[in-house]
């Protein structure tokens, strides 16, 4: 939905989350071109781009949420992802560098676009949150374990040890939405119920 | 490969009803939404309503009063209905497969049509 | 609804020329789908989600936008490319197409 609008079609809703999930997590669109922007697409190098476990919520502890405390729990770590991202795109080459040390602008757009993605995501978010709110049957929610603190990165003795800091949290970016795609798709049907 | 085969009459006499039944083969209804939509040359392409995978149906509100979708998955049809047909429902209906399992509101393969004339 | 127009309603390209035809939306959308209709066939998805090519679709095509304006672009026209073109969205309910722009070989 538009940025600032809600749909009140709840299977138009999910749609549209399950769309924006299932496209964030595709490693095309964030982490693949930061891995060339930062020179890091080497072998040996990707193998030290693996997330940290913890960094952000397993699928499992998703799974256990109900549906309105695992939206809280996205739109928390979501919003950890933002301040995160943010600290990425400040350390990022500007266009021009790119273009002299001749890497592809395509990518830096890339990673310019995921903030506002991100953004229409969580307001789609707000918008099933007020459509469950609205729905008969109430469901217990279920405080969530997720990252309510921006995933920190480790002292960076380096530029280079940033890079891979920032690799490492992307990967475990991709990785948490791909969860919480496959936690949508088995959002039932209806709004009053879920298939578990 | 996947496909959706239609059938249905070519003519329909004005306040009578129309059937079609799209049959569709390569992929199973349990898993994808079929979703109907209809081109007149007055109107253009107008989506017309769905039945989703667990067979819930959402319609398009200036058609909801008049449709009917239904569907046996074990025969793979998926059956359309509209009631109250007048000249200006005559167009090409087409059903069309939902892309995956999601509640995917577009259209990755569409069926062979059928062209309904609404006339006396 | 949300109302698509399309410009232009008819256009004609030499083989080999650009074409841009564009998509205006009445309110922002998040993501434009693209299909392709030839005389006397079904439509065909060409792009999903604003810039994705759907499967068999040749990498001439490609799509482009957001808020309220999408454009699709043919790199090097050819004979085949000839067909009318539509926009869709799926962000309000209901779904919603253009009209359509019709493009014809010189």
């Known amino acids: 939905a538009a940025i600032g609008s809600c749909s009140k079609e709840y299977r138009v809703l999910l749609g549209q989350l399950q769309k924006q999930t299932d496209l964030m997590q595709d490693t095309s669109r964030l982490l693949d071109p930061y891995i060339r922007i930062q020179g890091l697409d080497v072998p040996k190098l990707r193998e030290h781009c693996r997330e940290r476990p913890g960094a952000f919520p397993s699928e499992e502890t998703l799974r256990g949420l109900g549906r309105r405390g695992f939206l809280q729990t996205l739109n928390a770590t979501l919003g950890c992802v933002l301040h995160r991202l943010a600290d990425l795109e400040q350390r990022l080459p500007k266009a021009q560098d790119l273009e002299r040390s001749g890497l592809n602008i395509e990518d830096l757009e890339k990673l310019q676009m995921a903030r506002p993605n991100i953004l229409g995501l969580r307001n789609n978010i707000y918008c099933m949150a007020q459509l469950l709110d609205n729905s008969d049957t109430a469901e217990p929610t279920k405080a969530g374990r997720g990252a309510s603190q921006p995933p920190t990165p480790t002292p960076a003795s380096d530029a280079f040890q940033r890079k891979l800091e920032g690799c490492r949290f992307l990967h475990g970016y991709h990785r948490f939405m791909h969860s919480v795609g496959r936690v949508f798709s088995k959002w039932g049907e209806s709004p009053n119920r879920s298939r578990r | 490969q996947v496909q959706l085969k239609q059938s249905g009459p070519g003519l329909v006499q004005p306040s009578q009803s129309l059937s079609i039944t799209c049959t569709v083969s390569g992929f199973s209804l349990t898993n994808y939404g079929v979703h109907w939509v209809r081109q007149s040359p007055g109107k253009g392409l107008e989506w017309l309503g769905v039945i989703w995978r667990g067979g819930s149906t959402d319609y398009n509100a200036a058609f909801m009063s008049r449709l009917s979708i239904t569907k046996d998955n074990s025969r793979s049809q998926v059956f359309f209905k509209m009631n109250s047909l007048q000249a200006d429902d005559t167009a090409i209906y087409y059903c069309?497969?939902?892309?995956?399992?999601?509640?995917?509101?577009?259209?990755?393969?569409w069926g062979t049509g059928t062209t309904v004339t609404v006339s006396s | 609804q949300i109302v698509l127009t399309q410009s232009p309603t008819i256009m004609s390209a030499s083989p080999g020329e650009k074409v841009t035809m564009t998509c205006s939306g009445s309110?922002?959308?998040?993501?434009m789908y693209w299909y392709q209709e030839k005389p006397g066939s079904s439509p065909r998805l060409l792009i999903e989600?604003?810039?994705n090519l759907a499967s068999g679709v040749p990498a001439r095509f490609s799509g482009s936008g957001s808020g309220t304006s999408y454009s699709l672009t043919i790199s090097r026209m050819e004979a085949e490319d000839a067909a009318t073109y539509y926009c869709q969205q799926w962000s309000s309910y209901p779904p919603t197409f253009g009209s359509g722009t019709k493009l014809e070989i010189k």
């Open positions: 989600d604003t810039s």
């Open positions: 069309a497969k939902s892309p995956n399992s999601n509640f995917y509101w577009y259209f990755d393969v």
């Open positions: 309110s922002s959308v998040s993501y």
